[in-house]
């Protein structure tokens, strides 16, 4: 799994007027890492995980860079011609990755009102855009502005690929990112669904990294995908992740079903609690 740094900048306009505030979120290896608030930008660690790892480091450099990025994106939004009345947003997402073989990937994506309209591979400098006429118009608009105002937006757009990778390497070097494995806690619960049926839910929480296999098995055989419901793998705010899988089974058949979990090379099976016991908690052996 590669190391990654992801910047998510959002600026807003109201009735054609670009708002002064902006929001910047930075994710490090998929985890919320830094955030600049809408009105005043002060880079600050997100959650207990970031605080524990980052300690009392000051974030002046990041605050300066993110503030500059926000200003530049506001300038870009001001040059989008089809500003209609009401609320509109321009979002830029920039991602860079360092893979285990030291190869790198960098990309930049623009969204208007939540819809992707322009992407750039920052290594090859190749631009791509969706086929819709709206996206094409927006893309031409923004690309023309970036070409015309290259000097004004230099802080934001110049050598973004190098800047992003430089920051990521700096964080890696300073020990901010720890290659760690945190095993999940697995809970299996049951709830009445309908006459003669129960829903069994298997929840995995507190795990890192995010890759996990979670599925229901009957007599040791995986149930088909369409008989199971999966939740998204989501950050839980502690630098770890959570997810779930559920299926509906006949009452009395509980002992034939197990939740299978695989994470970072470790695996375990978890039975359905019988009778009145509602929650069964277990770690791997």
């Amino acid at each position: 799994e590669p190391h990654s740094l992801r910047y998510n900048l959002t600026v807003l306009s109201w009735d054609g007027s670009v708002q002064s505030g902006f929001l910047t979120e930075v994710h490090l290896d998929g985890q919320p890492f830094l955030r600049c608030d809408r009105q005043k930008c002060r880079a600050k660690p997100q959650g207990q995980w970031a605080e524990d790892v980052l300690g009392n480091k000051t974030w002046d450099r990041e605050t300066r860079d993110l503030t500059g990025n926000g200003k530049d994106l506001r300038m870009t939004l001001a040059h989008i011609k089809d500003q209609k009345e009401g609320l509109h947003s321009l979002q830029e997402i920039r991602v860079c990755e360092i893979h285990e073989d030291n190869s790198t990937r960098s990309s930049q994506h623009f969204y208007y009102d939540g819809e992707l309209f322009l992407s750039q591979n920052l290594e090859t400098k190749e631009w791509t855009m969706p086929q819709s006429s709206r996206a094409q118009t927006l893309a031409m608009n923004v690309r023309n502005f970036l070409k015309e105002d290259a000097m004004k937006t230099k802080t934001h757009y110049h050598a973004m690929h190098a800047d992003c990778l430089q920051e990521l390497r700096r964080y890696l070097k300073s020990g901010v990112v720890l290659r760690r494995t945190v095993p999940p806690m697995v809970n299996v619960t049951r709830s009445e669904a309908s006459e003669g049926n129960i829903t069994v839910t298997c929840r995995a929480s507190g795990f890192y990294p995010w890759n996990i296999t979670l599925s229901w098995r009957q007599d040791g055989v995986s149930l088909s995908h369409d008989t199971q419901q999966w939740g998204d793998v989501l950050p839980d705010g502690n630098g770890t992740y959570q997810t779930w899988v559920a299926t509906r089974i006949c009452q009395g058949e509980e002992q034939r079903f197990t939740c299978y979990m695989e994470h970072s090379g470790n695996h375990s099976t978890h039975p359905v609690p019988s009778g009145k016991v509602l929650v069964l908690q277990s770690h791997w052996q």
Partner: antibody, heavy 120, light 107 residues
Framework: EVQLVESGGGLVQPGGSLRLSCAAS????????MNWVRQAPGKGLEWVSY????????YYADSVKGRFTISRDNAKNSLYLQMNSLRDEDTALYYC?????????????WGQGTLVTVSS | DIQMTQSPPSLSASVGDRVTITCRAS??????LNWYQQKPGKAPKVLIY???SLQSGVPSRFSGSGSGTDFTLTISSLQPEDFATYYC?????????FGPGTKVDIK
Amino acid sequence: EVQLVESGGGLVQPGGSLRLSCAASGFTFSSYSMNWVRQAPGKGLEWVSYINYSENTIYYADSVKGRFTISRDNAKNSLYLQMNSLRDEDTALYYCARVMVRGTGTFDYWGQGTLVTVSS
Amino acid sequence: DIQMTQSPPSLSASVGDRVTITCRASQSISSYLNWYQQKPGKAPKVLIYGAFSLQSGVPSRFSGSGSGTDFTLTISSLQPEDFATYYCQQSYSTRFTFGPGTKVDIK
């Protein structure tokens, strides 16, 4: 005593069809998932298809997908395999096998097999 | 699909010998591994399930071990009725696959 008896095998030309049956007795058929497994003459075992007891999970080997259909009739305690577009390489002894309750996808009882020969 | 390999393909042994057959999966299959015995003209019979659990009615001289990708079936003291072909089978994936078999015959 658990018994599985296959039938329906025979000689068929390439491109032809056959329907195999497996009659189950000695256990509550509707509570068990079932499989078809085949064995070409002098060769090893090859899993063909799986159907769970509630009939909402069915799997096929890539080699038969789109040509074979597994089904069951719990009222008749029977398992079926409809085989279409048969090929020379489908020639084999076909076994039905029961999945053990609370096992690890374990086939705990097998029939004696029915021979399918595909040849022109 | 997950490929299963077995070694050796065949072996000759004497009554009383300790026999070990190995099975390797092309990717991790946790403990979803079963062992079967098949005698000529007969249907297979399950010996071990879940990599190491002995099926009811199977003599205790049969044992299984392993997890992940490497598994072993051991017959602690070979008996005349144990001369047969042995197959491993994975059920981790929903495309169940068998190993090619190991034939155990009399030396």
